[in-house]
């Protein structure tokens, strides 16, 4: 006969899981929110600026009670890539002002997309039903002059920061409920 | 100057409500979370909730859950507390306190308002 | 819930000695390059006052003789040369997990 079979794989424990996640959503929080500032002080904003190209915010009232695991881990999972891509976008074509940000936005880039693997790992150990492949976005236009490109940074590491929180909440909830 | 001003002492009777007003101010209200917490005499500091005031979706102690009811109105960078049904055992200070769910620590807190549940 | 734990629960020091104040936490808190404990001193009448976050990290404003540190489990407040000013009640508390708690206290007292 063959070799013994080995001892059958443990499905890692979710709470844990969710909780790395939560922890590493935490982390790139702090990261963004510190950059923002960073941005706030270099180059003050004037109120709220928007980039029609972000994705909406998930949620805008206190519907928290209402979600559901898969839902949040999708939605989280395409708002951040559509992040990703913003922020390298900005880092690209976001023009010599915003070089004083680095290498704070490279680092934040690379934290991104180590949340988002996690998220992808996340959804794999816990079986939920894979996204479909996102179809190619359609390439972001570069800012049309200086001050166009801090805008759309301000509104990037803005809308950020809000998905974030909003992220945090919404998985310490989930987690309480497993 | 960075503060959080909130409303005056409160007596209710037993199953009643109250509202508690947290007025910040010198800083961008929309840049900080606000958190609430109770400090009932001989006890230690409990933490009710937190809300964000640009999106709300207020997270809560599952011990206050159903009857604390955090919101805020951005227009007046107010924020506010509601505790339901009250009882003897709400008696205590309540604080609003600046926080952020990163690292979730209140570096500001408000002067604290007294609550007392008597009939 | 995670359960602090301060220790002593009283200590009585005069002017100018070290005091230690311990916290211990019921699971770790660290984790992910942070250790989520942080200090606050409150008096008589008066809200909490934070001096130390993130385990070691001195608030704007608070004075050099108060430190923080630790990992884990267990963390100390220390306050190298004690003033006037400084007897209080020390709360510890956490932020690794749903929800925060606080330590029940250390109260300071003057010998």
């Known amino acids: 006969p063959g070799p013994p079979p080995g001892p059958p794989r443990v499905s890692p424990d979710p709470r844990a899981e969710l909780d790395s996640t939560v922890l590493l959503t935490r982390s790139l929080l702090a990261d963004t929110r510190q950059l923002a500032a960073q941005l706030r002080d270099k180059f003050p904003a004037d109120g709220d600026h928007n980039l029609d190209s972000l994705p909406t915010l998930a949620m805008s009232a206190g519907a928290l009670g209402a979600l559901q695991l898969p839902g949040v881990l999708t939605r989280l999972r395409a708002d951040l890539l559509s992040y990703l891509r913003h922020v390298q976008w900005l880092r690209r074509a976001g023009g010599s002002s915003l070089k004083t940000l680095e290498p704070e936005l490279g680092t934040l880039q690379a934290r991104l997309d180590r949340l988002l693997r996690r998220l992808q790992l996340l959804m794999s150990r816990l079986a939920l039903p894979q996204p479909p492949p996102d179809p190619p976005a359609p390439p972001l236009a570069p800012p049309s002059s200086a001050w166009g490109g801090i805008r759309a940074a301000h509104a990037i590491l803005g809308g950020l920061h809000l998905t974030l929180d909003w992220a945090v909440r919404g998985l310490l909830l989930l987690k309480t409920r497993l | 100057e960075v503060q959080l001003v909130q409303s005056g002492a409160e007596v209710k009777k037993p199953g009643a409500s109250v509202k508690i007003s947290c007025k910040a101010s010198g800083y961008t209200f929309r840049d900080y979370n606000m958190d609430w917490v109770k400090q009932a005499p001989g006890q230690r500091l409990e933490w009710i909730g937190d809300?964000?005031?640009?999106?709300?979706?207020?997270i809560y102690n599952q011990k206050f859950t159903g009857r604390a009811t955090l919101t805020v109105d951005k227009s007046a960078s107010t924020a506010y507390m509601e505790l339901s049904s009250l009882r003897s055992e709400d008696t205590a200070v309540y604080y609003c306190?600046?926080?952020?769910?990163?690292?979730?620590?209140?570096?500001?807190w408000g002067q604290g308002t007294t609550v007392t549940v008597s009939s | 819930d995670i359960v602090l734990t301060q220790s002593p629960a009283s200590l009585a020091l005069s002017p100018g000695e070290r005091a230690t104040l311990s916290c211990r936490a019921s699971?770790?808190?660290?984790?992910?390059?942070?250790?989520?404990i942080h200090w606050y001193q409150q008096k008589p009448g008066q809200a909490p006052r934070l001096l130390i976050y993130l385990a070691s990290n001195l608030e704007s404003g608070v004075p050099a003789r108060f430190s923080g540190s630790g990992s884990g489990t267990d963390f100390t407040l220390t306050i190298s040369s004690l003033e006037e000013e400084d007897f209080a009640t020390y709360y510890c508390?956490?932020?690794?997990?749903?929800?925060?708690?606080f330590g029940q206290g250390t109260k300071l007292e003057i010998k």
């Open positions: 809300i964000n005031p640009t999106i709300g979706a207020p």
């Open positions: 508390q956490h932020s690794r997990d749903l929800p925060p708690t």
């Open positions: 699971k770790s808190v660290s984790t992910e390059g942070y250790s989520y």
């Open positions: 306190a600046r926080g952020e769910l990163a690292h979730w620590y209140f570096d500001v």
